[in-house]
Structure formats: structure tokens, C-alpha cells
């Protein structure tokens, strides 16, 4: 994750001395502050090469992120700079200093230079973490077409402000675990994975904890892959119709297709008393087909006005694309004007590859 997508006016600079190894310093800064984290060598001895890490990912120096062997500066701090920072020995990856940094909306006043008081006292009683919007976290299964982006959210609160970490299938999940990495937004309690692929499928758990307790939520991600197919026609359409002589009738056909579909409406006819030709293909007449100014929406409806007995019979919606054809058929029954309407049976469905 790149540090910093938010630059604000630089306020004060707050330099924070490093904690004893093994301790975690909880720090709060205002938006726009310059965050300075200091990690002197233990016992004042030589330190050797070090790396600064945020949320498990090594920090890359930039015009805004200044990395030194004993000091890290993040200018114009913003929400996205919140997270877990550590200074580690490059060779052993031993953690020398560890900081939990939170950047709040309001620029800090300058009174709490190290921000420790603010981290511990948010004005409410101390307590274990809790979900702030549980009613908006009901979606446990996320089915996402490949190449799109996923965002898991676990908005929480507590005092002291809890930390959030993520697991995939029960194991710690970090950016280096997937091609393309991950993006963490601690302020938004969220994990983002861009351009998902099938290997991203699994169970993702957010773990939110402070010293008073821990809560977790698990989401299941399914990455959907598409194989090309012939058009899909909505079940039950067109529906059988019974109409009174002289009335108007509409048949509907809903077509789903990746490749551009070609839609036709056909009426089955008899030729020399036969409904099918020598090869078994039905005799049909084309009632409606795509024209220069015909939209797909218009093609999905066949309108028959002032129906006669000759209009009775079988009608077919035929849809084809570069993969193949599908068709559904329905029957029209025309009754004399004085007879009551009688519902016909449901339409049958036929597919052709």
C-alpha cells in the first residue's frame, strides 16, 4: 500500500521517541501533522541496517515519506497514514520499535505532543470493541466477477481505540500474499483488493481488538468466472395467452447475452398440412426481426393488434449470438368474443445449441 493519498497543510511536527523494544506506542496525530517516529538503537549501541514497515509492508521513500535509519517522517499526515508502524533490523527482521499511529480528522491542537492521552481517553468509558454499524454488515457472502474490486468493511469502536487486522482462511493476511497487494484503510476499517482473481476466493476475517476484548467478522469471497454462452432466455417468457377475438395481445421475451444477440419473433405455420419440413425443421414465418432503428427492448416484445382466429397458434422468441441459439415458445388461444377467458397452461422451454 502506498502511504499517503491525502496531503494537507502541514501543522506542527511531532517527534515521538521510540518505546522500549516489545512495547507498542499508541499515538494520535491530527490531519496535516508531520509524523516523526524515532527509534534509537537499543542501549545506544550500533543499530545496523534497518527497515521501516507499515501494516506489514515495507515503506518506500518519497517526497512525503522520509526514511532514515533511526527516524521516519511522514509529512502531511492523513487517515490513510493510520496503522501499525515498526522499525526492524533488515537482516533478522527483529522489531526494534513498534508504533500504533492514528490520524484523526481534526488537526491536533499541539497540546498533547505525543498524543498518548488522546489515544487512551476518547471521552467515553473504557471498553471492549463493538461494531458501530452492525446492521450494515449483513452481507456475509460476496460473489464478485473476476477483474473487479472487493472492499471488506468492519466499522468498529472502543476505548482505547481498537486495532484491526485481517486473516484469510484463518491465517494472517498481508499485502505480499497476493499479486497486486492489498489496500488497508484503518480509519475506514476496510480492506480492499483490486482486480480479483480466482485465487482470491476464501474466508476473510477482520479481527478488531483492544486490551479489553476482541471481536471478529468473517466474509466469504467467491470470484466468478465467465465462460461464453448462447443467449439465456428468462424462464416463463413468453407466456401462453388466451385472448378474445379483436383484442390486443403482447408476448414478452427477456434475453440475456454477453455477445450481441439477434432476436426474432416467429409464428409456426403449416405448409401442405405439415408443421415441419422433411428435415424436421418447423415451418415458421418471421414476424419481427432487427431493423436499422429497432432497439433490443422493442424486440423483446411482440404486439398483436385486433387478433383474429388466424392469429391463434404457436409463437417463438428466437435469440442467437456468436455462440449459439436459444428459443422459448408460447401459445395463443383466440376465443369468440362472448366466451369467458380461460387461462392456458404455462409455456414450455426449448434450447438449441
Amino acid at each position: 500500500e502506498s502511504l499517503g493519498t491525502e496531503q494537507r497543510v502541514v501543522g506542527r511536527a511531532a517527534e515521538v521517541p521510540g518505546p522500549e523494544p516489545g512495547q507498542q506506542e499508541q499515538l494520535v496525530f491530527g490531519s496535516g501533522d508531520a509524523v516523526e517516529l524515532s527509534c534509537p538503537p537499543p542501549g545506544g549501541g550500533p543499530m545496523g541496517p534497518t527497515v521501516w514497515v507499515k501494516d506489514g509492508t515495507g515503506l518506500v521513500p518519497s517526497e512525503r515519506v522520509l526514511v532514515g535509519p533511526q527516524r521516519l517522517q511522514v509529512l502531511n499526515a492523513s487517515h490513510e497514514d493510520s496503522g501499525a508502524y515498526s522499525c526492524r533490523q533488515r537482516l533478522t527482521q527483529r522489531v526494534l520499535c513498534h508504533f500504533s499511529v492514528r490520524v484523526t480528522d481534526a488537526p491536533s491542537s499541539g497540546d498533547d505532543e505525543d498524543g498518548e492521552d488522546e489515544a487512551e481517553d476518547t471521552g467515553v468509558d473504557t471498553g471492549a470493541p463493538y461494531w458501530t454499524r452492525p446492521e450494515r454488515m449483513d452481507k456475509k457472502l460476496l460473489a464478485v466477477p473476476a477483474a473487479n474490486t472487493v472492499r471488506f468493511r468492519c466499522p468498529a469502536a472502543g476505548n482505547p481505540t481498537p486495532s484491526i487486522s485481517w486473516l484469510k482462511n484463518g491465517r494472517e493476511f498481508r499485502g505480499e500474499h497476493r499479486i497486486g497487494g492489498i489496500k488497508l484503510r484503518h480509519q475506514q476499517w476496510s480492506l480492499v483488493m483490486e482486480s480479483v482473481v480466482p485465487s482470491d476466493r476464501g474466508n476473510y476475517t477482520c479481527v478488531v481488538e483492544n486490551k479489553f476484548g476482541s471481536i471478529r467478522q468473517t466474509y466469504t469471497l467467491d470470484v466468478l468466472e465467465r465462460s461464453p454462452h448462447r443467449p439465456i432466455l428468462q424462464a416463463g417468457l413468453p407466456a401462453n395467452q388466451t385472448a378474445v377475438l379483436g383484442s390486443d395481445v403482447e408476448f414478452h421475451c427477456k434475453v440475456y447475452s454477453d455477445a450481441q444477440p439477434h432476436i426474432q419473433w416467429l409464428k409456426h405455420v403449416e405448409v401442405n398440412g405439415s408443421k415441419v419440413g422433411p428435415d424436421g425443421t418447423p415451418y415458421v414465418t418471421v414476424l419481427k426481426t432487427a431493423g436499422a432503428n429497432t432497439t433490443d427492448k422493442e424486440l423483446e416484445v411482440l404486439s398483436l393488434h385486433n387478433v383474429t382466429f388466424e392469429d391463434a397458434g404457436e409463437y417463438t422468441c428466437l435469440a442467437g449470438n456468436s455462440i449459439g441459439f436459444s428459443h422459448h415458445s408460447a401459445w395463443l388461444v383466440v376465443l369468440p368474443a362472448e366466451e369467458e377467458l380461460v387461462e392456458a397452461d404455462e409455456a414450455g422451454s426449448v434450447y438449441a445449441g
Epitope: T5, E6, S78, H79, E80, R133, R136, M137, D138, K139, K140, L142, V144, P145, A146, A147, N148, T149, V150, R151, F152, R153, P155, R185, Q188, V192, S195, Y219, L224, E225, R226, P228, V255, Y256, S257, D258
Partner: antibody, heavy 127, light 107 residues
């Protein structure tokens, strides 16, 4: 490299029709979508509609609903904007843009992001 | 429809200046907001999505923040190529709607 190229623009009389094409390369439609956005001369951007390839669904701005139709032929990696009953106020540069979704667990909504755009094609509706 | 209102409509600035553009939605759009940059005669380019995510390849001097109804695009140190018109756009509601644009001109 992702590229989108629009074509089919031109001069058309009020009430007339025009079909714009958007040829894509460097990606396939099957999991993402194509949006159309227009910009009248000297004005801001206006979203026209979107084709979502996964389910073949389309969405339109109220100003074009019933007149414009978006479709796609994934075998040709091309999207189309069929414009009927054109009016003078439809005069604009029309852009197509690759569109992907951000699927969110929060409230189960999808945010649509237009990340690659074509160069645009000018449609002029005038008598 | 959700109305998006940008301010200012235009501004004059010099190279190296820090520039802030705001965008206000007529109703809550959570973080479903993108920022685009457009130069005359050219197509728009995506800068920021989901309110604060920097799109790949976009310089880190661009940043976005906000959620709900109030959003900000910040350019920390204006460069010559940044003189353009900037648009915000929401996509949580239907239809997707753009702000009217903010033109950043050379002082």
C-alpha cells in the same frame, strides 16, 4: 495496453438516429462494463448510461431513457450506443469508458469506476 | 437525483501552490466518489476513486478525503500539467452524477 476507440459520430437531423461504436482492446468485457458519458460544447460531463457485461444489464440517465440503447458484442469486444429520436440537446462529444465495480460488504452496494476513456466522438443534432 | 456541487467553480494558482477543491453531495454517498481531471479537447482521466484511493499511475501529490456528503481533492504542489478542469462524480445513487467542474488556471 487498454484502449477504447469511439466511432460513428456525425451530423444528424432532429428526430434522426445514430449508432456509436466503442472498440476496446487490452481487456475483455466479460466481467466488467462500458459506460457512456457525454459533454456538450463548453459544458460539464453527463453520465448517459452503462452496460454491465456480467448480467447484460443496462442503466440509463432519465434524459435518454427510452431513446438510447447500450449493447455490446463481446465476441468483437465492442460496445454500442444506439441513439434514436435525437434532439438538439443531445449535441455533445460522446465518450465510452471501461467501467469496473467495487463490490462492498457494507450495505452490499457496488460502486462503479470509469478508469479508461476513449478519445470521444462528436455528435451534432441540427437541421 | 443526487446533486454534486463543486467549489470553487474556478481558481487561479501558481506552480508549487497547494490547491484544494471541495465537492458536496445533496445526500449521503458514503465513500462512493471519484475525481477526474480533464484537459481541453481531451478525455477525462481518473485520479481518485472511493473518495481516497489514488488510482495507479497518478502522482502522489493528488489526494482525496471525505465521506458522506463532503469531499476534498487536494493537489499538494501544483505542477504545470495540473492546470485543467476537475470533476467529482458519485456512483452510489442512480443515476451517476458529476459535479459541474472546477477549472484550475494559471495565475
Amino acid at each position: 495496453e487498454v484502449q477504447l476507440v469511439e466511432s460513428g459520430g456525425g451530423l444528424v437531423q432532429p428526430g434522426g438516429s445514430l449508432r456509436l461504436s466503442c472498440a476496446a482492446s487490452g481487456f475483455t468485457f466479460t466481467s466488467t462494463g462500458i459506460s457512456w458519458v457525454r459533454q456538450a460544447p463548453g459544458k460539464g460531463l453527463e453520465w448517459v448510461g452503462r452496460y454491465w457485461a456480467w448480467d447484460g444489464s443496462t442503466n440509463y440517465a432519465d434524459s435518454v431513457k427510452g431513446r438510447f440503447t447500450i449493447s455490446a458484442d463481446t465476441s468483437k469486444n465492442t460496445a454500442y450506443l444506439q441513439m434514436n429520436s435525437l434532439r438538439a440537446e443531445d449535441t455533445a462529444v460522446y465518450y465510452c469508458a471501461r467501467t469496473y465495480g467495487i463490490y462492498d460488504t457494507y450495505d452490499n452496494y457496488t460502486e462503479y469506476v470509469m478508469d479508461y476513456w476513449g478519445q470521444g466522438t462528436l455528435v451534432t443534432v441540427s437541421s | 437525483d443526487i446533486q454534486m456541487t463543486q467549489s470553487p467553480s474556478s481558481l487561479s494558482a501558481s506552480v508549487g501552490d497547494r490547491v484544494t477543491i471541495t465537492c458536496r453531495a445533496s445526500q449521503d454517498v458514503d465513500t462512493s466518489l471519484a475525481w477526474y481531471k480533464q484537459k481541453p479537447g481531451k478525455a477525462p482521466k481518473l485520479l481518485i476513486y472511493s473518495a481516497s484511493f489514488l488510482y495507479s499511475g497518478v502522482p502522489s501529490r493528488f489526494s482525496g478525503s471525505g465521506s458522506g456528503t463532503d469531499f476534498t481533492l487536494t493537489i499538494s504542489s501544483l505542477q504545470p500539467e495540473d492546470f485543467a478542469t476537475y470533476y467529482c462524480q458519485q456512483s452510489t445513487g442512480h443515476p451517476q452524477t458529476f459535479g459541474q467542474g472546477t477549472k484550475v488556471e494559471i495565475k
